[in-house]
Interface confidence: low
């Protein structure tokens, strides 16, 4: 079976690759824009050259493309503590990131926050802060892992799963939270 | 986009009870600790309470404490919080949040919901 093609795909895969098919004449095949610019007017015959315009300050193409429009560019999203690694440039995107000793942590494919590595209090670190995961602490004993963090055992009780790793503690245990299911 | 929905304020009298109520959307609410924070007028946001992600551990502020109660449907993608014997310095507005991590900086979207407490 071969996979369905949008309208677009359809017309484009008629031409050389670079090259993509005149809307209102399919017999001429013009050259696509280089990246940094957009489709102004499309060529006028076969071997003549497309017309195309550079983006305008605050928006871009990254590839070659016959868009009628450049892309806005994108902003960091301050309150999700993002920081700007590079500007927005005719042919690239803002770049954001997040400052040092801080990772990633997506809330969806293209929305990203900026939280502080953990720092592995009362444990030691099995692995590194990354990009986009936080540090995996290892805890002492006398503490049990809780959404990544070392907590003391004496906060453990019967019905949490800490109860293996804080066994010889637990049976003088009075807990400070409430713990009853929903 | 990560949304979240408050709803269920109103004017209360002191001693009364309300029910917030948060719809949540744009992220998978099971995978995350949920809970509501506050800011009364002209003063700073305070933590309320908090529920972990399968609803098996809650914690509240002190001032809150025996009075409120957090709680949450995984399979509506909703967070409650019921309000009982309700206080006039209970009153602010109350957002919804979410949370990576126990003590992990929160994020909350939305407009809140305003709680007044009065006679």
């Known amino acids: 079976l071969v996979p369905h093609l949008g309208d677009r795909e359809k017309r484009d895969s008629v031409c050389p690759q670079g090259k993509y098919i005149h809307p209102q004449n399919n017999s001429i095949c013009c050259t696509k824009c280089h990246k940094g610019t957009y489709l102004y007017n499309d060529c006028p015959g076969p071997g003549q050259d497309t017309d195309c315009r550079e983006c305008e300050s605050g928006s871009f193409t990254a590839s070659e493309n016959h868009l009628r429009h450049c892309l806005s560019c994108s902003k960091c999203r301050k309150e999700m503590g993002q920081v700007e690694i590079s500007s927005c440039t005719v042919d690239r995107d803002t770049v954001c990131g997040c400052r040092k000793n801080q990772y990633r942590h997506y809330w969806s494919e293209n929305l990203f926050q900026c939280f502080n590595c953990s720092l592995c209090l009362n444990g030691t670190v099995h692995l590194s802060c990354q990009e986009k995961q936080n540090t995996v602490c290892t805890c002492h004993a006398g503490f049990f892992l809780r959404e990544n963090e070392c907590v003391s055992c004496s906060n453990c009780k019967k019905s949490l799963e800490c109860t293996k790793l804080c066994l010889p503690q637990i049976e003088n245990v009075k807990g400070t939270e409430d713990s009853g299911t929903t | 986009e990560v949304q979240l929905l408050e709803s269920g304020g109103g004017l209360v009298q002191p001693g009364g009870s309300l029910r917030l109520s948060c719809a949540a959307s744009?992220?998978?609410?099971?995978?995350?600790?949920m809970g509501w924070v506050r800011q009364a007028p002209g003063k700073g946001l305070e933590w309320v309470s908090q529920?972990?992600?399968?609803?098996?551990?809650?914690y509240y502020a002190d001032s809150v404490k025996g009075r409120f109660t957090i709680s949450r449907d995984n399979s509506k993608n909703t967070l409650y919080l019921q309000m009982n014997s309700l206080r006039a310095e209970d009153t602010a507005v109350y957002y919804c949040a979410i949370y990576t991590g126990r003590w992990e900086p929160f994020v909350y979207w939305g407009q809140g919901t305003l709680v007044t407490v009065s006679s």
């Open positions: 529920i972990a992600n399968t609803g098996d551990r809650r």
């Open positions: 744009g992220f998978t609410f099971v995978k995350y600790s």
